[in-house]
């Protein structure tokens, strides 16, 4: 069992996969969120709105994701366990202005494999 | 099962993979969420809306993901477990204004391999 006192937990496990959660302010209307592993972009989700308020969500890397009004969660099914890696989210805010781009806090993920369990140590 | 006192769990395991959840405010209508491992972008999901309120989701890195109205979850199927890594989400908020980009809270994920189980230790 894993306990923590933080308001937000970036990593969680579901059905053998890792869910990485990238939070953003609820006031944000249009944005791009990218998930990095080290320097590699694993997932990218862009939400924009058109002139009639229709929402366009682009997921060019075909990541499994869950989008809410204050976070984007990416689901990685078989994370590479050969070595630990640092994951972080990068946020581009298009709306409301002004345009902003920032790296969100991240975490180091190391998965120890076995047939029965995977032990995750998460330091925030 | 992984429990904690946090309002949001970032990591969880599903079917041998890791789900990393990136939360964002429910008021956010259009956004991009990126998941980083260290400085590498693993996933990026973008949600936008058109003028008739139709939603477009872009997932350029083809990550497995789940999108809700306040989070995006990415599923990593084989996270590298040779060493621990820091994961975090980066959020770009396009709508509502002003545009914002920020790194969300992250976590250190270390997976210990064995033949029997995958145990997750999470320090928040």
């Amino acid at each position: 069992e894993i306990n923590g006192s933080a308001d937000h937990r970036m990593f969680s496990f579901h059905n053998g996969g890792v869910q990485i959660s990238c939070k953003y302010p609820e006031t944000v209307q249009q944005l791009k969120m990218r998930l990095f592993r080290e320097r590699e972009v694993l997932c990218e989700l862009t939400k924009t709105k058109g002139s009639g308020n229709a929402v366009s969500i682009k997921n060019p890397m075909l990541c499994l994701y869950h989008l809410s009004n204050n976070s984007v969660s990416f689901f990685l099914n078989n994370p590479d366990s050969s070595q630990g890696s640092y994951y972080f989210c990068s946020l581009s805010i298009f709306d409301p202005p002004p345009f902003q781009e920032r790296n969100l806090s991240g975490g180091y993920l190391h998965i120890y494999e076995s047939q029965l369990c995977c032990q995750l140590k998460l330091w925030l | 099962e992984i429990n904690g006192s946090a309002d949001h769990r970032m990591f969880s395991f599903h079917n041998g993979g890791v789900q990393i959840s990136c939360k964002y405010p429910e008021t956010v209508q259009q956004l991009k969420m990126r998941l980083f491992r260290e400085r590498e972008v693993l996933c990026e999901l973008t949600k936008t809306k058109g003028s008739g309120n139709a939603v477009s989701i872009k997932n350029p890195m083809l990550c497995l993901y789940h999108l809700s109205n306040n989070s995006v979850s990415f599923f990593l199927n084989n996270p590298d477990s040779s060493q621990g890594s820091y994961y975090f989400c980066s959020l770009s908020i396009f709508d509502p204004p002003p545009f914002q980009e920020r790194n969300l809270s992250g976590g250190y994920l270390h997976i210990y391999e064995s033949q029997l189980c995958c145990q997750l230790k999470l320090w928040l």
Epitope: G52, N53 | S51, G52, P96
Partner: antibody, heavy 117, light 111 residues
Framework: EVQLVESGGGLVQPGGSLRLSCAAS????????MDWVRQAPGKGLVWVSN????????EYSPFVKGRFTISRDNAKNTLYLQMNSLRAEDTAVYYC??????????WGQGTLVTVSS | DIVMTQSPDSLAVSLGERATINCKSS??????????LTWYQQKPGQPPKLLIF???TRHTGVPDRFSGSGSGTDFTLTISSLQAEDVAVYYC?????????FGPGTKVDIK
């Protein structure tokens, strides 16, 4: 500098067709929704259609739905409007516009379409 | 469809004086904390130019004599001190839903 240049307008008979083009430059075209807005001579502005960043979402004004088709070629940085079954009331200056997240922040100079016999 | 109306149809104001244009929508444009209402300026022979978005936020480069206010269904564009270059037609526009619609425009001249 953002530039939008329309072309393809002209005189056409009722029932005829035209294809408008809009060449975009000075910005990452594939990052933006794009729209067509028209203005009849001496009249106000009327929204016609829009398209999302990769062309997967398109929307139309009730006045043109079923007759007009919006499309884009991101490799060519070009927006299109195929207009079929044209009517006299479609006569207008057609503007290509960039939807800048919360408003039409860039406009072309427009191309005049005249539908008359 | 949401119907946008503007008043007056036209107005003439002396240089340096205040000009006020009203816009009314047939239903509320408020969603969350944002009003999906924009204002455009169109000078003779030119395409429109974005002035104000989200009812009250000036677009980049717009002089501070232009201001927007209002919420819900009633909105106002104010030019605090009219300049010669402000002669134009001003349109309100909503992007609350589809189809987005414009008001009929208000023509501003110098008295």
């Amino acid at each position: 500098e953002v530039q939008l240049v329309e072309s393809g307008g002209g005189l056409v008979q009722p029932g005829g067709s035209l294809r408008l083009s809009c060449a975009a430059s000075g910005f990452t075209f594939s990052d933006y929704w794009m729209d067509w807005v028209r203005q009849a001579p001496g009249k106000g502005l009327v929204w016609v259609s829009n398209i999302d960043e990769d062309g997967s979402i398109t929307e139309y004004s009730p006045f043109v739905k079923g007759r007009f088709t919006i499309s884009r070629d991101n490799a060519k940085n070009t927006l299109y409007l195929q207009m079929n079954s044209l009517r006299a009331e479609d006569t207008a200056v057609y503007y290509c516009t960039r939807w800048g997240r919360f408003g039409f922040d860039s406009w072309g100079q427009g191309t005049l379409v005249t539908v008359s016999s | 469809d949401i119907v946008m109306t503007q008043s007056p149809d036209s107005l003439a104001v002396s240089l340096g004086e205040r000009a006020t244009i009203n816009c009314k929508s047939s239903q509320s444009l408020l969603s969350g904390s944002f009003n999906y209402l924009t204002w455009y300026q169109q000078k003779p022979g030119q395409p429109p130019k974005l002035l104000i978005f989200y009812a009250s936020t000036r677009h980049t480069g717009v002089p501070d004599r232009f201001s927007g206010s209002g919420s819900g269904t009633d909105f106002t564009l104010t030019i605090s001190s009219l300049q010669a270059e402000d002669v134009a037609v001003y349109y309100c526009h909503h992007h609350y839903n589809a189809p987005p619609t414009f008001g009929p425009g208000t023509k501003v001249d110098i008295k």
